[in-house]
Interface confidence: low
């Protein structure tokens, strides 16, 4: 899916005002600390395109986050604020209730939820360039796509 | 621990330029915006302008473009401002600040100490 | 550019009694931060985001406010709050008020 359209400033509202506090409530009792963030993303559609994979896509040491809180949330902050997005997802939902029924938070999820929160936490300040300020420059040009 | 460490204080004449550094520590340079704001003897502070280690993006005040230049160099984790022009009335302390997303906007949660910059023939 | 007028510009008031500073903004802002100042030291954050109270700043300070004025309450002056506040603003870039002094009277 190409996040491009979303409208990246209602996203950002739907996760300041409850998707960071419900990825806060999973990570409780984890130090801040206790993670590397090794995944990062360049611009918004690229975050949202990371976010998504992390969120929603099974991995080794933690089958399924999707039917957490925030990734709940998120799923339906997408569904509304991304055009499109809701009739792609229809496949991956059924693959999703088939991964996990039952709900066991190892280190590899306390990883995952992690990275997330740096994806988040960088979809949030993109870039000066969508601060409003007709004056920006940017000497790296760091808008790198990358498509999964 | 956070901490911003600027270089020492300068003395320039009318016409010169100043470059300010700013030693970042204690987290990842590249996560968090820099500021520059100053002060000239009692007044109030002045923000100069910010830059986005991350990839360089900056962004000035106008009252100060074309004369100041922030800069990052991230293997060192270091930021600088750079001033040209020099006048008397650019007498003051310098400082750097931390800007981070938090409690829903971005402020200053962390400064360095200052550094004094004294313009006088 | 937003522009922030502090008032009053100083504050003379005794330990024990309650100072009220006001930060008004020229259009209407989100949120405003707070920093105090002591003589020879940087700022330091004291309220983020309107009401939040940075680390360490005790519960006798408060925020409030909303679209073009904001208020810095100490509800008891205690020796150690005597300095100089100033407001910020983030909404379009960043601009500071001018700063109340508190000071003893």
């Known amino acids: 899916y190409d996040f491009t359209n979303c409208d990246f400033e209602k996203i950002k509202a739907a996760y300041l005002s409850t998707i960071s506090k419900d990825l806060i409530t999973y990570m409780s009792g984890t130090k801040s600390t206790e993670f590397n963030n090794t995944v990062s993303c360049s611009n918004r559609p690229h975050c949202l395109t990371e976010i998504q994979s992390l969120t929603f896509n099974p991995t080794a040491g933690c089958a399924s986050l999707a039917k957490e809180m925030f990734a709940m949330k998120t799923k339906a902050a997408l569904a509304i604020w991304c055009p499109g997005y809701s009739e792609t997802q229809i496949n991956a939902t059924q693959a999703m209730k088939k991964a996990r029924k039952s709900k066991v938070t190892t280190n590899k999820c306390l990883e995952q939820v992690s990275q997330l929160q740096g994806l988040w936490r960088r979809f949030n300040r993109p870039l000066l360039k969508q601060q409003g300020s007709s004056d920006y420059k940017d000497d790296d040009d760091k808008h790198h796509h990358h498509h999964h | 621990e956070v901490q911003l460490v600027q270089s020492g204080a300068e003395v320039k004449k009318p016409g010169a330029s100043v470059k300010v550094s700013c030693k970042a520590s204690?987290?990842?340079?590249?996560?968090?915006?820099m500021n520059w704001v100053r002060q000239a003897p009692g007044q109030r502070l002045e923000w100069m302008g910010i830059i986005s280690p991350y990839n360089g993006g900056t962004s000035y005040n106008q009252k100060f473009k074309g004369r100041v230049t922030i800069t990052r160099d991230t293997s060192a984790s270091t930021a600088y401002m750079e001033l040209s022009s020099l006048r008397s009335e650019d007498t003051a302390v310098y400082y750097c600040?931390?800007?981070?997303?938090?409690?829903?906007?971005?402020?200053?949660?962390?400064w360095g100490q200052g550094t004094t910059v004294t313009v006088s023939s | 550019e937003i522009v922030l007028t502090q008032s009053p510009a100083t504050l003379s008031l005794s330990p024990g009694e309650r100072a009220t500073l006001s930060c008004r903004a020229s259009s209407s802002v989100s949120y405003m931060h707070w920093y105090q100042q002591k003589p020879g030291q940087a700022p330091r954050p004291w309220i983020y985001a309107t009401s939040n109270l940075a680390s360490g700043v005790p519960a006798r300070f408060s925020g409030s406010g909303s679209g073009t004025s904001y208020t810095l309450t100490i509800s008891r002056l205690e020796p150690e709050d005597f300095a100089v506040y100033y407001c910020?603003?983030?909404?379009?870039?960043?601009?500071f008020g001018g700063g109340t002094k508190v000071e003893i009277k």
């Open positions: 600040a931390r800007e981070d997303y938090d409690y829903d906007g971005y402020a200053m949660d962390h």
């Open positions: 204690g987290y990842t340079f590249t996560d968090d915006y």
């Open positions: 910020q603003q983030w909404s379009s870039n960043r601009t």
